[in-house]
């Protein structure tokens, strides 16, 4: 009788095993092993037992021990089962961004691995099992469909193989694919809202705001703002599911005309765009020209207002005659005209909008100095020891400097409260002086002595 030990072996692919072939008779004519595997006999004492080292076991095999005894020939098989983990565990590639609400098919492919009866394929979201199936076919393929939800954003999907050899006294061998990180997104069907000036003046700055609600995840949204070929650099502020992109736009004379303003929002693999037109115009403020901004009293002054050729002007509220870009007025400068403003208002129509520009110039009329009876009385009579405030006001532009001296030495304290004494009495020469010249006026102070009964 031929026997083999062990009768069943599970070993890793490429491994080695010692197989003992025994026979029940003492002097067998023949004792050996039949196998395609490389073998090496280990020398043992006795004739009824042989030990072989079988090496480089690549696949399941059934080596057969045989013996030829006087009572006949017999055989015994040992069952070698080779185990190995899959060579490839892979999730079929998918776009990383997936819109919420879409059915996403996850497909796992497994190449190799044995014994297949012990090999299971598991699809996972994070640590949660979505599907578990035995590995069937080469390559084995397991699929499942997932309805993409907002809370799946950032989730890792993976595929795991489990080679469970615990019943065979070994362990559980796991292989996991590279994870697929799902980026979910919501991009509403409504285009972004674009708020901008419809018209913009050359060499000025305008503000453009592009906003959109109902986005997820809002922080991943890309906003592209452009005016013609000019890419704008917006400052983006985010809400829970909304953003607002604000950009400053500067335009030059080269941009004059109608330009396309675009706001594109890109999220995931989708985009929404809004277009608007902006008219860029040049409209300098009207020019107010005074023959001279500073004139002496009595000088003839011409005030001209000139504006953009297509503008219509009014000068100090009076429209140009005929209505057009030029207006003028003539006047003889008087002191009352000092500080008078000449305002020119120009109106230009741009893309259906009326644009208004103003320019104001002030006329300075130099006059005086003046010292007259009303503001600088020539005679004061005050009781001795009374409190009085000598008043003398000089007029003119520029405002004159005023001094009143008696005998070229003693000043009259203009605008100050003084106690009237005999010293105050006398004739003072008041002089008012400015760049326009000087005027003089005599002021007499009389002091009344108290009467004693």
């Amino acid at each position: 009788q031929t026997s083999v030990s062990p009768s069943k072996v599970i070993l890793p692919r490429g491994g080695s095993v010692l197989v003992t072939c025994s026979t029940s008779c003492d002097q067998p004519k023949l004792l050996g092993i039949e196998t395609p595997l490389p073998k090496k006999e280990l020398l043992l004492p006795g004739n009824n037992r042989k030990v072989y080292e079988l090496s480089n076991v690549q696949e399941d095999s059934q080596p057969m021990c045989y013996s030829n005894c006087p009572d006949g020939q017999s055989t015994a098989k040992t069952f070698l089962t080779v185990y190995w983990t899959p060579e490839r565990v892979e999730l079929a590639p998918l776009p990383s961004w997936q819109p919420v609400g879409k059915n996403l098919t996850l497909r796992c492919q497994v190449e190799g691995g044995a014994p297949r009866a012990n090999l299971t394929v598991v699809l996972l979201r994070g640590e949660k099992e979505l599907k578990r199936e035995p590995a069937v076919g080469e390559p084995a393929e397991v699929t499942t469909t997932v309805l993409v939800r907002r809370d799946h954003h950032g989730a890792n999907f993976s595929c795991r193989t489990e080679l469970d050899l615990r019943p065979q006294g070994l362990e559980l061998f796991e292989n996991t694919s590279a994870p697929y990180q799902l980026q979910t997104f919501v991009l509403p069907a409504t285009p972004p809202q674009l708020v901008s000036p419809r018209v913009l003046e050359v060499d000025t700055q305008g503000t453009v705001v592009c906003s959109l609600d109902g986005l997820f995840p809002v922080s991943e949204a890309q906003v592209h703002l452009a005016l013609g070929d000019q890419r704008l650099n917006p400052t983006v502020t985010y809400g829970n599911d909304s953003f607002s992109a604000k950009a400053s736009v500067s335009v030059t004379a080269e941009d004059e005309g109608t330009q396309r303003l675009t706001c594109a929002v890109i999220l995931g693999n989708q985009s929404q765009e809004t277009l608007q037109t902006v008219t860029i115009y040049s409209f300098p403020a009207p020019n107010v020209i005074l023959t001279k901004p500073e004139v002496s009293e009595g000088t003839e002054v011409t005030v001209k207002c000139e504006a953009h050729p297509r503008a219509k002007v009014t000068l100090n509220g009076v429209p140009a005659q005929p209505l057009g870009p030029r207006a003028q007025l003539l006047l003889k400068a008087t002191p009352e005209d000092n500080g008078r403003s000449f305002s020119c208002s120009a109106t230009l129509e741009v893309a259906g909008q009326l644009i208004h520009k103003n320019q104001t110039r002030e006329l300075r009329v130099l006059y005086g100095p003046r010292l007259d009876e009303r503001d600088c009385p020539g005679n004061w009579t005050w009781p001795e020891n009374s409190q009085q405030t000598p008043m003398c006001q000089a007029w003119g532009n520029p405002l004159p400097e005023l001094k009143c001296l008696k005998d070229g030495t003693f000043p009259l304290p203009i605008g100050e409260s003084v106690t009237v004494t005999r010293d105050l009495e006398g004739t003072y020469l008041c002089r008012a002086r400015s760049t326009q010249g000087e005027v003089t006026r005599k002021v007499t102070v009389n002091v009344l002595s108290p009467r004693y009964e």
Partner: antibody, heavy 123, light 107 residues
């Protein structure tokens, strides 16, 4: 009554120096701008220099700039003219004179004059 | 600098005559003009300032006029004591230039 009394004139050789003084009395000297005016023999009046009431601003005629220095000592009620590098053409009667009024930013006509002092520059 | 010119350089008139001396500035000096009288060996004396204002103590026969660049000093009735040199002076800014003077004599 106000008075300006001058001293310091005399005969001096070309290239030498001389200092004229002008003492004021009967007026608030420190309130007024003061001037020097000269008159060459048989000629007209020539303004020479001015100093503001507090001594902060000084101006000179081009003919004396860099050679003459005007100064004042308000505590002594005295005006000075330091004349250096004297030339024959500096020969003249030198008068000190007071601004009529004590204006803030400008000078005035001259209402009081000193009696004059003769400076002769001769070798 | 502003240049002051006077004319005539000298004049002779009879007692009681009205005489006029003119003074011209090379630029506008408004009415910043003074007139001085100088008798031989004496310091000048202020007659008129602000072109037309008579200094205290000066006889009313003296009067001044003008503004801008052209000015005049008039002695309405010439007196023997009026024999002197007369100078105009501009005083709006330094240098406070004098005119060359006009010598007035009695015929």
């Amino acid at each position: 009554q106000m008075q300006l009394v001058q001293s310091g004139g005399g005969v001096v050789q070309p290239g030498r120096s001389l200092r004229l003084s002008c003492a004021a009395s009967g007026l608030t000297f420190s309130s007024y701008g003061m001037h020097w005016v000269r008159q060459a023999p048989g000629k007209g009046l020539e303004w020479v220099a001015v100093i503001s009431y507090d001594g902060s601003n000084k101006y000179y005629a081009d003919s004396v700039k860099g050679r003459f220095t005007i100064s004042r000592d308000n505590s002594k009620n005295t005006l000075y003219l330091q004349m250096n590098s004297l030339r024959a053409e500096d020969t003249a009667v030198y008068y000190c004179a007071k601004d009529f009024y004590n204006w803030n930013d400008w000078h005035d006509a001259f209402d009081i004059w000193g009696q004059g002092t003769m400076v002769t520059v001769s070798s | 600098d502003i240049v002051m010119t006077q004319s005539p350089s000298s004049l002779s008139a009879s007692v009681g005559d009205s005489v006029t001396i003119t003074c011209r500035a090379s630029q506008d000096i408004s009415n910043y003009l003074a007139w001085y009288q100088q008798k031989p060996g004496k310091a000048p004396k202020l007659l008129i300032f602000a072109a037309s204002t008579l200094q205290s103590g000066v006889p009313s026969r003296f009067s001044g006029s003008g503004s801008g660049t052209d000015f005049a000093l008039t002695i309405s009735s010439l007196q023997p004591e009026d024999v002197a040199s007369y100078y105009c002076q501009k005083y709006n800014h330094v240098p406070q230039t004098f005119g060359p003077g006009t010598q007035v004599d009695i015929k």
